[in-house]
C-alpha cells in the first residue's frame, strides 16, 4: 500500500507479484525479492519497501535474495540469483543481523 506523504519522499517502483494492485507502486524504496520454497522453482517479486530496510542488507542464501534501490523504477530490469546450494554445515541463516 502507498504510505502517507508525511513519511518522506516516495519513489515509484515496478510492481510484479501476486499482491500487486497495478503495474507500479509507491514506497520509500523499490525492492526485488527472489524466493525459492522447498521443491519449487525460484520466484522473483518486484515491489515497494516501506519497513525493515535491514532486509536489504541481508546476504543472499540458497533460499532468498533481497535487493533494494532508491530511484524511479530502479527495480524494473534487475535480475537476482541465489547462492549455490551448500552443505548443511555451511548453510547461512536467514537472519539479517
Amino acid at each position: 500500500d502507498p504510505v502517507k506523504p508525511s513519511r518522506g519522499p516516495l519513489v515509484t517502483c515496478t510492481c510484479e507479484s501476486p499482491h500487486c494492485r497495478g503495474p507500479t507502486c509507491q514506497g520509500a524504496w523499490c525492492t526485488v525479492v527472489l524466493v525459492r520454497e522447498e521443491g519449487r522453482h525460484p520466484q522473483e517479486h518486484r515491489g515497494c519497501g516501506n519497513l525493515h530496510r535491514e532486509l536489504c542488507r541481508g546476504r543472499p542464501t540458497e533460499f532468498v535474495n533481497h535487493y533494494c534501490c532508491d530511484s524511479h523504477l530502479c527495480n524494473r530490469n534487475v535480475s537476482l540469483v541465489l547462492e549455490a546450494t551448500q552443505t548443511p554445515s555451511e548453510q547461512p541463516g536467514t537472519d539479517s543481523q
Epitope: D1, R7, P18, H19, L51, H52, R53, V64, G93, T94
Partner: antibody, heavy 118, light 108 residues
C-alpha cells in the same frame, strides 16, 4: 478480517525447546505488505519483542535472544512458528503473534501462556 | 537499539479528565513509526495510534497522538471508565523493535 491464533504446549521442561505456531486466517501470509512478529510478556511485566519473519523467509531477531530463537514460515499452511531453545524459568511468559505493517501491529493473537517447569 | 522511556509510570485520574502520556526515544524514530497500544488484564494489546498521530480503525476519537523525532504524546481527551488500563508506546518498522515500559492509568 484477518485473525491470528497461537498454538502449542503450555508446559515445557527446563533445557528443552519451546515450540509455538501462529495460524493466519482471513488473509495471506505471503503479502509483501506484512511482517509477522512474535512478542512475549513475562508475568506482570511489559512487552518484549522476540523477532519477525517476512514471507520470503528472511528473519530478524531480538539481539538478546538471537542465539536461542528460530522463526520459520510455512506459506502453504499460512502459518509461522517460533522455536526457543534451552528454556529456563525466565522464559515463562504469555507469547503473542502479531502482524506488522506501516500501520503498526494492527492484528494480534489472543496470546498463549507457556510455563517452564519440571 | 532505540530505548523508549514512558512517563509517568502510573497516572491517577478520574473519569472525564484529560490524560497525557509521554514517550521519549533515545534516538530519532524513523518515518515517525511510533505506535501506542492499550492493554487490559488478560487481553492482548490493542493498537490505538500508528505513525505517531494516525488513529487505528475503530478507535474512538478521544484518543490522539502527536510528536515527532524523539518526543511523543498520547492524549485521551475525556477519560471513560473503560480507558483505565496500561498503555505502551512502540518503535516499529526497523529492527530491533522496542516497547516502552508502560504507563498504568488508574482510577483516582
Amino acid at each position: 478480517q484477518v485473525q491470528l491464533q497461537e498454538s502449542g504446549p503450555g508446559l515445557v521442561k527446563p533445557s528443552q525447546t519451546l515450540s509455538l505456531t501462529c495460524t493466519v486466517s482471513g488473509g495471506s501470509i505471503s503479502s509483501n505488505d506484512y511482517y509477522w512478529n512474535w512478542i512475549r510478556q513475562h508475568p506482570g511485566k511489559g512487552l518484549e519483542w522476540i523477532g519477525y519473519i517476512y514471507y520470503s523467509g528472511s528473519t530478524y531477531y531480538n539481539p538478546s535472544l538471537k542465539s536461542r530463537v528460530t522463526i520459520s514460515v510455512d506459506t502453504s499452511k499460512n502459518q509461522f512458528s517460533l522455536k526457543l531453545s534451552s528454556v529456563t524459568a525466565a522464559d515463562t511468559a504469555v507469547y503473542y503473534c502479531a502482524r506488522e505493517s506501516t500501520d503498526g501491529m494492527d492484528v494480534w493473537g489472543q496470546g498463549t501462556t507457556v510455563t517452564v517447569s519440571s | 537499539e532505540n530505548v523508549l522511556t514512558q512517563s509517568p509510570g502510573t497516572l491517577s485520574l478520574s473519569p472525564g479528565e484529560r490524560a497525557t502520556l509521554s514517550c521519549r526515544a533515545s534516538q530519532s524514530v524513523s518515518s515517525n513509526y511510533l505506535a501506542w497500544y492499550q492493554q487490559k488484564p488478560g487481553q492482548a494489546p490493542r493498537l490505538l495510534i500508528y505513525g505517531a498521530s494516525s488513529g487505528a480503525t475503530g478507535i474512538p476519537d478521544r484518543f490522539s497522538g502527536s510528536g515527532s523525532g524523539t518526543d511523543f504524546t498520547l492524549t485521551i481527551s475525556r477519560l471513560e471508565p473503560e480507558d483505565f488500563a496500561v498503555y505502551y508506546c512502540q518503535h516499529y518498522g526497523s529492527s530491533p523493535i522496542t516497547f516502552g515500559q508502560g504507563t498504568r492509568l488508574e482510577i483516582k
